[in-house]
């Protein structure tokens, strides 16, 4: 499970006019960590755990950096040409990670009205964009704006990659990141599928970290990959995660099937309710 620092900035426009202020949230290892409200950015520690460990210097530095990034993002939103009337949002999510093998990752993602349209690997500078023509038009528009001054862009992206990792390392060193394990709650449900068949779904929720193995077994043997459907591992808003796996089985054979869960070295099996 890598250590991660995630910045989420949002700016708004109304009838083509970019609004002042912005919203910023920072997550450390998936936990809410800092927040700036819309009008006046003052980085606030999310919870006593953050405030206790880090001093005022941290909040001053984060406030300064987030304010600068918010200004940049407002300028970017102003350059999006196809803004229709009404309310629109531009969101920038920046993530950096340090993995167990000490390898690092840094990426940046832009969303317009909640739709991803442009990503960049900040370490390698590779840009990627979804295939839809709307996303590609937006992406080229924003990218060209960001590339207008190549030297500025170069400094900007490398600074973001380095700064994010530097902050993450600083937080790790300070001891603010306390590794913890929260075991999942596992719940198995069944529903009618078609005549003679039922769909059984195994849900795991409230777990941390996010790595989990969830699969269906028949007579103790794992079912093949293509006979099972998996949900994404998603944050549930409480700093923990949730996911599910489902398969279709013959009615009357429920007792042969179990859901197998493995998380942080612990494992358990869960039968289908009759």
């Amino acid at each position: 499970e890598p250590h991660s620092l995630r910045y989420n900035l949002t700016v708004l426009s109304w009838d083509g006019s970019v609004q002042s202020g912005f919203l910023a949230e920072v997550h450390l290892d998936g936990q809410p960590f800092l927040r700036c409200d819309r009008q006046k950015c003052r980085a606030k520690p999310q919870g006593q755990w953050a405030e206790d460990v880090l001093g005022n210097k941290t909040w001053d530095r984060e406030t300064r950096d987030l304010t600068g990034n918010g200004k940049d993002l407002r300028m970017t939103l102003a350059h999006i040409k196809d803004q229709k009337e009404g309310l629109h949002s531009l969101q920038e999510i920046r993530v950096c990670e340090i993995h167990e093998d000490n390898s690092t990752r840094s990426s940046q993602h832009f969303y317009y009205d909640g739709e991803l349209f442009l990503s960049q690997n900040l370490e390698t500078e590779e840009w990627t964009m979804p295939q839809s023509s709307r996303a590609q038009t937006l992406a080229m528009n924003v990218r060209n704006f960001l590339k207008e001054d190549a030297m500025k862009t170069k400094t900007h992206y490398h600074a973001m990659h380095a700064d994010c990792l530097q902050e993450l390392r600083r937080y790790l060193k300070s001891g603010v990141v306390l590794r913890r394990t929260v075991p999942p709650m596992v719940n198995v449900t069944r529903s009618e599928a078609s005549e003679g068949n039922i769909t059984v779904t195994c849900r795991a929720s409230g777990f941390y970290p996010w790595n989990i193995t969830l699969s269906w077994r028949q007579d103790g043997v794992s079912l093949s990959h293509d006979t099972q459907q998996w949900g994404d591992v998603l944050p549930d808003g409480n700093g923990t995660y949730q996911t599910w796996v489902a398969t279709r089985i013959c009615q009357g054979e429920e007792q042969r099937f179990t859901c197998y869960m493995e998380h942080s070295g612990n494992h358990s099996t869960h039968p289908v309710p009759s």
Epitope: P2, H99, E100, D101, S103, T104, R105, S107, S119, N121, E123, T124, E125, E126, W127, T128, K147, A150, T153, K154, H158
Partner: antibody, heavy 115, light 108 residues
Framework: QVQLQESGPGLVKPSETLSLTCTVS?????????WNWIRQPPGKGLEWMGF???????KYNPSLKSRITISRDTSENQFSLKLSSVTAADTAVYYC????????WGQGTTVTVSS | EIVLTQSPATLSLSPGERATLSCSAT???????FHWYQQKPGQAPRLLIY???NLASGIPARFSGSGSGTDYTLTISSLEPEDFAVYYC?????????FGQGTKLEIK
């Protein structure tokens, strides 16, 4: 049609500097992508050496970092590799390639390090 | 650095058979930065599959790719004589970019 072509001496003496150039046609090296050098010793696998990106940023393989320099000449649409203090272990086919998933490659040039 | 390990090192199959090549990483890789190449003797490698599952230009549909995290697979559904070559996986998630050591697909 994007094309890449490596050029440079095929024989380099030990302790000297290996110099290669990749000439790109059909695409501007300042528009996008990373412009890479990759090598393959005889009978062995591929090793990424480094790149110069569209913005001019360079990234190198740490295993070569003290010896490698990649530069570009935007007016000629070329990028170059210099590898100093070469030994017999640097004998390889040297390729230039475009991108991050390397979609276009040069045909490769064989460089032998020998006295 | 992220080390990629390909298996098997050599795969001996006959034309018409299905080939499955694996690539395992020491650290998680984003699927959009994972690629496969084919190399024939005396030639430069050529991009086969990019971003885990997308066929590169001119590559026949018998080639397919899948995977996520640390485990990736290249599948050739029915081998043609021209498919016998060396196959390399590559990650572009983090610097240095790295390749697997290669899988040699040979005629049985």
């Amino acid at each position: 049609q994007v094309q890449l072509q490596e050029s440079g001496p095929g024989l380099v003496k030990p302790s000297e500097t290996l110099s290669l150039t990749c000439t790109v046609s059909g695409y501007s090296i300042t528009s996008d992508y990373a412009w890479n050098w990759i090598r393959q010793p005889p009978g062995k696998g591929l090793e990424w050496m480094g790149f110069v990106s569209y913005s001019g940023t360079t990234k190198y393989n740490p295993s070569l970092k003290s010896r490698i320099t990649i530069s570009r000449d935007t007016s000629e649409n070329q990028f170059s590799l210099k590898l100093s203090s070469v030994t017999a272990a640097d004998t390889a086919v040297y390729y230039c390639a475009r991108g991050y998933g390397f979609d276009y490659w040069g045909q490769g040039t064989t460089v032998t390090v020998s006295s | 650095e992220i080390v990629l390990t390909q298996s098997p090192a050599t795969l001996s199959l006959s034309p018409g058979e299905r080939a499955t090549l694996s690539c395992s990483a020491t650290s998680s890789i984003s699927s959009i930065y994972f690629h496969w190449y084919q190399q024939k003797p005396g030639q430069a490698p050529r991009l086969l599959i990019y971003r885990t599952s997308n066929l590169a230009s001119g590559i026949p549909a018998r080639f397919s790719g899948s995977g996520s995290g640390t485990d990736y697979t290249l599948t050739i559904s029915s081998l043609e004589p021209e498919d016998f070559a060396v196959y390399y996986c590559q990650q572009g998630t983090t610097i240095p970019f790295t390749f697997g050591q290669g899988t040699k697909l040979e005629i049985k």
